[in-house]
């Protein structure tokens, strides 16, 4: 667990959110890609 000094602006410093979702195919697209292949 995180002690208080690990929090800044209310979020755990070490916890990383997922990448922003990608909506690649124009106005009609409802699919999202968040995790591209690693190279």
């Amino acid at each position: 667990s995180y002690s208080m000094e690990h929090f800044r602006w209310g979020k755990p410093v070490g916890k990383k959110r997922r990448p922003v979702k990608v909506y690649p195919n124009g106005a009609e697209d409802e699919s999202a890609e968040a995790f591209p292949l690693e190279f």
């Epitope: 959110r17 990448p19 979702k21 909506y23 124009g26």
Partner: antibody, heavy 110, light 112 residues
């Protein structure tokens, strides 16, 4: 699906201003949204974002200067205490995509 | 925060030529890198995401490469319509101390 910003106007320094991004054709409960700005003749600058679940993150320079919140169809960007350096066109963007609004111009001047 | 450094600031090439734009991230962003094209008075247009995947309707003359911290955008067979400013964008996840969404400073492409 469309995205449109509104609320941009001429304000004096220190006067809070809230910009609204209104979306149609999709629900914000399923999409990540980013606020980006562009000063006249300058490059793109990411201010902050709100994830589909409502979690918000801000660029370091933007913390304490902006707040982002949302409903099911709108995303608000509040400029807490505008300075002349906040003069820019503000864009709302659906994640990484071609869903950018046309932008709304904020001018901060005394 | 992730800082994106883009070079050059401006580049000029002839119709039919090739230009390469470089983008460097201050920390590894895996392949969470997009490229946008912006023309005056318009919002940016998505060209490439996941570092190398072309967005819908983008011609294959645009090629993105790279991963980690080093990325490039190459535009071949330049057309007059390619004259624009190009931006790289990281979209890695954020944490409480590091914001993962950042743009490069932009590269103006001038087509002669």
């Amino acid at each position: 699906q469309s995205v449109k910003e509104s609320g941009g106007r001429l304000v004096t320094p220190g006067t809070p201003l809230t910009l609204t991004c209104t979306v149609s054709g999709f629900s914000l409960s399923n999409y990540d949204m980013i606020w980006v700005r562009q000063a006249p003749g300058k490059g793109l600058e990411s201010i902050g974002m709100i994830y589909d679940d409502g979690d918000t993150y801000y660029a370091s320079w933007a913390k304490g200067r902006f707040t982002i919140s949302k409903t099911s169809t709108t995303v608000d960007l509040k400029i807490i205490s505008p300075t002349t350096e906040d003069t820019a066109t503000y864009f709302c963007v659906k994640g990484v995509s071609n869903h950018w609004g046309p932008g709304t111009l904020v001018t901060v001047s005394s | 925060d992730v800082v994106m450094t883009q070079t050059p600031a401006s580049v000029e090439a002839a119709v039919g030529g090739t230009v390469t734009i470089k983008c460097q991230a201050s920390q590894s962003i895996s392949s969470y890198l997009a490229w946008y094209q912006q023309k005056p008075g318009q919002p940016p247009k998505l060209l490439i995401y996941s570092a190398s995947t072309l967005a819908s309707g983008v011609p294959s003359r645009f090629k993105g490469r790279g991963s980690g911290t080093e990325f490039t955008l190459t535009i071949s067979d330049l057309e007059c319509a390619d004259a624009a400013t190009y931006y790289c964008q990281s979209y890695d996840g954020s944490s409480g101390s590091s914001y993962g969404v950042g743009f490069g400073g932009g590269t103006e492409v001038v087509v002669k």
